[in-house]
């Protein structure tokens, strides 16, 4: 069954959007008027995981690319990345758990707490132009909550 | 060997909370999830929810407001309570072990408990 | 949800008799669906996963097959510990549901 997906942007709390940094990273910083066409478009696409009432598994990939978030051990620590994948057989229902994101809506927000490493979340820095990155706090400096825009 | 043994009262009144308890052994409830499944007298059977390794949970719909399902991994059990119970909510009740084999059957039950029966009456 | 309609709902055979049940569910569920059988006053054991996968001590009589909406579960020679309740079950998304069940009776 093809997997239902649909596409949209994040901003931060603060209202950085995401854009690309190099072929495999991503971005946070302010962007205004003409320049907004720069964010990236993700297709989130609805796949299996551990599923909860407060949590839906998700996968999060670029829109009209092979390149999905994904969150992997790097000298011993929880980290995000962009990894190429073969289009032919991506996005699907049984994502692997390294691609698979908890997406959790509190107060109109939304956060994204990674399968494969609990309590991680996809987070940004308060500083501008940083990495988007895994982080392993909340409500602390870094930024775990997100909005969502629907793009058609 | 995996087994699970549920237990509880047999007997609850109408109003009350049904609680019941699933004793599990050859897993760890830290690595599995467990479903809570019901079975009216010569009726079919009816999915209640159930509770991740991480113990987040999932409840389904019809009996959300009134479920709770909890664990408590190091006495390896996991407890169902019903609450404001009718006549409705007589059956046996079963747990059950989650495959969780990621891209594979992460959803399916392999192992079942022997089930209790719980009656609802004054 | 995905509801999961089954039949027979009730089915006569005699030892020896290669036997049908079919399952169709209200969605594509490429193949996550299970096959549970159930003898009176016993829980629910486990026949088939994943549509057509036979866990380890399953007997080879029993098979399955299908994918998306349309699933079969057949037992090639009936025999008489088999004569049971069986459930279709559908692990492909939250909540799960299972089958209304069929009563295979001796005939």
């Known amino acids: 069954a093809p997997v239902r997906s649909l596409h949209c942007t994040l901003r931060d709390a603060q209202l950085k959007s995401l854009v690309m940094s190099g072929p495999y990273e991503l971005k946070a910083l302010h962007l205004q008027g003409q320049d907004l066409e720069q964010q990236v478009v993700f297709s989130m696409s609805f796949v299996q995981g551990e599923e909860s009432n407060d949590k839906i598994p998700v996968a999060l990939g670029l829109k009209a690319k092979n390149l999905y978030l994904s969150c992997v051990l790097k000298d011993d620590k929880p980290t995000l990345q962009l990894e190429s994948v073969d289009p032919k057989n991506y996005p699907k229902k049984k994502m692997e758990k390294r691609f698979v994101f908890n997406k959790i809506e509190i107060n109109n927000k939304l956060e994204f707490e990674s399968a494969q490493f609990p309590n991680w979340y996809i987070s940004t820095s308060q500083a501008e132009s940083m990495p988007v990155f895994l982080g392993g706090t909340r409500g602390g400096q870094d930024i775990t909550d997100f909005t969502m825009q629907f793009v058609s | 060997e995996v087994q699970l043994q549920e237990s509880g009262p047999g007997l609850v009144k109408p109003s009350e909370t049904l609680s019941l308890t699933c004793t599990v052994s050859?897993?760890?409830?830290?690595?599995?999830?467990v479903s809570w499944i019901r079975q009216p007298p010569g009726k079919g059977l009816e999915w209640l929810g159930l509770?991740?390794?991480?113990?987040?949970?999932y409840y389904n719909s019809p009996l959300k407001s009134r479920l709770t399902i909890s664990k408590d991994t190091s006495k390896s059990q996991v407890s169902l309570k019903l609450s404001s119970v009718t006549a409705a909510d007589t059956a046996v009740y079963y747990c059950?072990?989650?495959?969780?084999?990621?891209?594979?059957?992460?959803?399916?039950?392999?192992?079942w408990g022997q089930g209790t029966l719980v009656t609802v009456s004054s | 949800d995905i509801q999961m309609t089954q039949s027979p709902s009730s089915l006569s055979a005699s030892v020896g008799d290669r036997v049908t049940i079919t399952c169709q569910a209200s969605?594509?569920?490429?193949?996550?669906l299970n096959w549970y059988q159930q003898k009176p006053g016993k829980a629910p054991k486990l026949l088939i996963s994943?549509?057509?996968t036979l866990p380890p001590g399953v007997p080879s009589r029993f098979s399955g097959s299908g994918s998306g909406t349309d699933f079969t579960f057949t037992i090639s020679s009936l025999q008489p510990e088999d004569f049971a309740t069986y459930y279709c079950?559908?692990?492909?998304?939250?909540?799960?549901?299972f089958g209304q069940g069929t009563k295979l009776e001796i005939k």
């Open positions: 059950a072990k989650q495959t969780n084999i990621w891209g594979y059957d992460l959803y399916g039950m392999d192992y």
């Open positions: 050859g897993f760890s409830l830290r690595d599995y999830g």
């Open positions: 509770i991740w390794g991480s113990g987040d949970t």
């Open positions: 969605q594509d569920i490429d193949m996550d």
């Open positions: 994943q549509a057509n």
């Open positions: 079950l559908q692990s492909d998304w939250l909540p799960l549901t």
